[in-house]
């Protein structure tokens, strides 16, 4: 029985060239979190945080992705191409799979209004 819910940072905006934290939080379940996957809009994996193995950042993103804080993910040196959907997938036992969605909009430096709660200056 999947009783949990995922809270995310929702729709966020960040400045081109800057950084942003993607954050999800699983609540309302006692399930064990064994792994968290971070994926981009085109289904490509950015990073995995495994309970035993720790973080694995996929090679294509090594230069621009930093693990954390917590189970979150920090995207650096943002480009306009980073605009789009990001998904956190929590693999848990005994519940199974929970998925959260974040929409990131990367704005030109001159336009950026920093609405993101987890924004890094």
């Amino acid at each position: 029985m999947m009783t949990g819910t995922i809270e995310t940072t929702g729709n966020i905006s960040a400045k081109k060239g800057g950084s942003v934290i993607l954050q999800c939080h699983l609540s309302s379940t006692m399930a064990q979190v064994t792994q968290v996957n971070w994926e981009q809009h085109d289904h490509s994996l950015l990073a995995i945080r495994n309970a035993e193995l720790g973080w694995h950042i996929y090679p294509a993103f090594k230069d621009r992705v930093a693990p954390g804080p917590g189970l979150g993910l920090t995207l650096q040196s943002l480009t306009m191409n980073d605009t789009g959907e990001y998904f956190c997938t929590y693999h848990t036992y005994p519940d199974g799979t929970y998925r959260g969605r974040i929409f990131l909009e990367v704005l030109e430096s001159s336009v950026a209004e920093h609405s993101a709660r987890f924004q890094i200056p």
Partner: antibody
Amino acid sequence: EVQLVESGGGLVKPGGSLKLSCTASGFTFSSYAMSWVRQSPEKRLEWVAEISSGGSYTYYTDTVTGRFTISRDNAKNTLYLEMSSLRSEDTAMYYCARKRRDYYGMDYWGQGTSVTVSS
Amino acid sequence: DVQITQSPSYLAASPGETITINCRASKSISKYLAWYQEKPGKTNKLLIYSGSTLQTGIPSRFSGSGSGTDFTLTISSLEPEDFAMYYCQQHNEYPWTFGGGTKLEIK
């Protein structure tokens, strides 16, 4: 080349025990969660058990909980399934399978080892 | 447990044809369905995962679609080596469960 080779199957009486092994090669065994899946004589597939990469987490289907134990020895690149209190409905071909690194499905399977529970 | 109903259980087709196999889950499994191919004397092969993502090394004539409760495996322009048994499996919640299988034979 990724290879998974099961062994240890055989004929056993109801209530008996058996220990299956699966020897892995061609990949970093300690980086992957592993599963046992069985196929009944009627060709139905059933997920049996799973173990995390380091062995800290083990999961079972309800029908085998308390009777089967999944374990692994990462130094020996080997996965195990210890089966006790065997029943006729446990008769099946038992396969070990590697879980994808991202946990989406099982990307490599062994050839299987046959277990028959009969008096 | 999530029940998976796979149809048809048997399918006869000719090389070059396009076929579809369906799987229906007893409740929503989001996009988390995998498809496998089973052939005698060979190890089971993962074809598709997460509903529509093609496993590395699998020919593009295999495709998957669907989300929620209804999923489809399509094999376009059948090759002789495609005649085999096919199974779907949900990887959304424990225990992982499989469909009953589809035997694809040459007409």
